[in-house]
Interface confidence: low
């Protein structure tokens, strides 16, 4: 650009565009400066004066170079089932993600809108698919020869111990009980303890329920177990 138009505001050449970190102001018909992240346009440019920028107020932010008249409001505080993985600053919004042991049942552009606790498989059921940041645990009934005696979101069905003499046969929720001599345990593939997933950023996923063996239970639920101390996240 010629020297006389190197400083904003300036009129762009016919068919030309404004430079990086500048915007074209329709009213002034000039290329004017954008405001940096953490600031907003307090006074718009004219033909003779450039944009006047000002810092964002508390609990507001701008993440990009901009010419917005007001900074954006940071999201509400994270609920008790979430952790704040990014604080609200003048340059970035607060990001809430689900805390460990929870998964994101309803995402938003950044972070998670609604967390749900990972389902716990009841005795007689083991983890078929472990929970992730965005999906619930899926439980399955323990197959013959395997059992789970725990209420857990990580334990899979384990093989019954093999007895020389069986005192009490095992079932889906109880290991076999041997009489006296030392038992051996059959080596079923994948008989391992699954790690608890750690929540980070998340995307939308459909809640996936899982069976339980609770007597007389019924309503088939799309979200996992919820402890008393759960925060409200709203839809």
């Amino acid at each position: 650009l010629p020297a006389q138009v190197a400083f904003t505001p300036y009129a762009p050449e016919p068919g030309g565009t404004c430079r990086l970190r500048e915007y074209y102001d329709q009213t002034a018909q000039m290329c004017c400066s954008k405001c940096p992240p953490g600031q907003h346009a307090k006074v718009f440019c004219t033909k003779t004066s450039d944009t006047v920028c000002d810092s964002c107020e508390d609990s507001t932010y701008t993440q990009l170079w901009n010419w917005v008249p007001e900074c954006l409001s940071c999201g509400s505080r994270c609920s008790s089932d979430q952790v704040e993985t990014q604080a609200c600053t003048r340059e970035q919004n607060r990001i809430c993600t689900c805390r460990p042991g929870w998964y994101c049942a309803l995402s938003k552009q950044e972070g998670c809108r609604l967390c749900a606790q990972l389902r716990k498989c009841r005795p007689g059921f083991g983890v078929a698919r472990p929970g992730t940041e965005t999906s619930d645990v899926v439980c399955k009934p323990c197959a013959p020869g395997t059992f789970s005696n725990t209420t857990s979101s990580t334990d899979i069905c384990r093989p019954h111990q093999i007895c020389h003499v069986v005192a009490i046969p095992g079932n889906a929720s109880m290991d076999a009980v041997c009489t006296s001599t030392s038992p051996t345990r059959s080596m079923a593939p994948g008989a391992v303890h699954l790690p608890q997933p750690v929540s980070t950023r998340s995307q939308h996923t459909q809640p996936t329920p899982a069976p339980s063996t609770a007597p007389g239970t019924s309503f088939l639920l799309p979200v996992g177990p919820s402890p008393p101390a759960e925060g409200s996240t709203g839809d």
């Epitope: 329920p209 339980s212 239970t217 639920l221």
Partner: antibody, heavy 116, light 110 residues
Framework: QSLEESGGRLVTPGTPLTLTCTVS????????MIWVRQAPGKGLEYIGF?????SAWYASWAKGRFTISKTSTTVDREITSPTTEDTATYFC?????????????WGPGTLVTVSS | AYDMTQTPASVEVAVGGTVTIKCQAS??????LAWYQQKPGQRPKLLIY???TLASGVPSRFKGSGSGTQFTLTISGVECADAATYYC????????????FGGGTEVVVK
């Protein structure tokens, strides 16, 4: 353990109406609540539910038309701007959010009539 | 998503006969289906959950079966007390659905 809906009455179209489901012998910090309605001579229609922490999910048709909220012993469901199509018996039902949950516990229902 | 289609809308059966009610989901809901019985002026009563598990206190003449998208409620040895409307209900996803219930089936006992 019991549930009882209240607040059902005759209202004119556009008049906001709040229905309350009062629980007895149930800990709403571990139980969730579902709202269902039934127009005269029609089937059951799911409205939405609220989880123990207070987060609410709604049927797609009910978003913006209904608001569900709760206290420690009650769950409220507001019809923001009732129309004659909202005339129905409204039920609340509770279930354990652990495992399947349990909806054998339903309130008797409360009748809402929207008429000019 | 997860629309529930219940058939027939109405069925007539003689005492001692058998009734079959079908419920179809528009997408797989695995085994997350419950059946309810409702009589006029009363609240719904749970009969079966997780597709085939009988709820406490429900007579064994009620039987649920199916998985995925196709489900069936069978009432064998029908009694006069079984005259009611029966609803299926999916429990796989409540987040963005129109209704979790089927349209209902009226059972008339002759």
């Amino acid at each position: 353990q019991s549930l009882e809906e209240s607040g059902g009455r005759l209202v004119t179209p556009g008049t906001p109406l709040t229905l309350t489901c009062t629980v007895s012998g149930i800990d709403l910090s571990t139980y969730a609540m579902i709202w269902v309605r039934q127009a005269p001579g029609k089937g059951l229609e799911y409205i939405g539910f609220i989880r123990p922490g207070g987060s609410a999910w709604y049927a797609s048709w009910a978003k913006g038309r209904f608001t569900i909220s709760k206290t420690s012993t009650t769950v409220d469901r507001e019809i923001t701007s009732p129309t004659t199509e909202d005339t129905a018996t409204y039920f609340c039902a509770t279930y354990d959010t652990y495992g399947y949950g349990d909806t054998r516990l339903w309130g008797p229902g409360t009748l809402v009539t929207v008429s000019s | 998503a997860y629309d529930m289609t219940q058939t027939p809308a109405s069925v007539e059966v003689a005492v001692g006969g058998t009734v079959t009610i079908k419920c179809q989901a528009s997408e797989s809901i695995f085994s997350y289906l419950a059946w309810y019985q409702q009589k006029p002026g009363q609240r719904p009563k749970l009969l079966i959950y997780y597709a085939s598990t009988l709820a406490s206190g429900v007579p064994s003449r009620f039987k649920g079966s199916g998985s995925g998208t196709q489900f069936t409620l069978t009432i064998s040895g029908v009694e006069c007390a079984d005259a009611a409307t029966y609803y299926c209900q999916q429990g796989y996803d409540f987040s963005a659905v129109d209704n979790v219930f089927g349209g209902g089936t009226e059972v008339v006992v002759k």
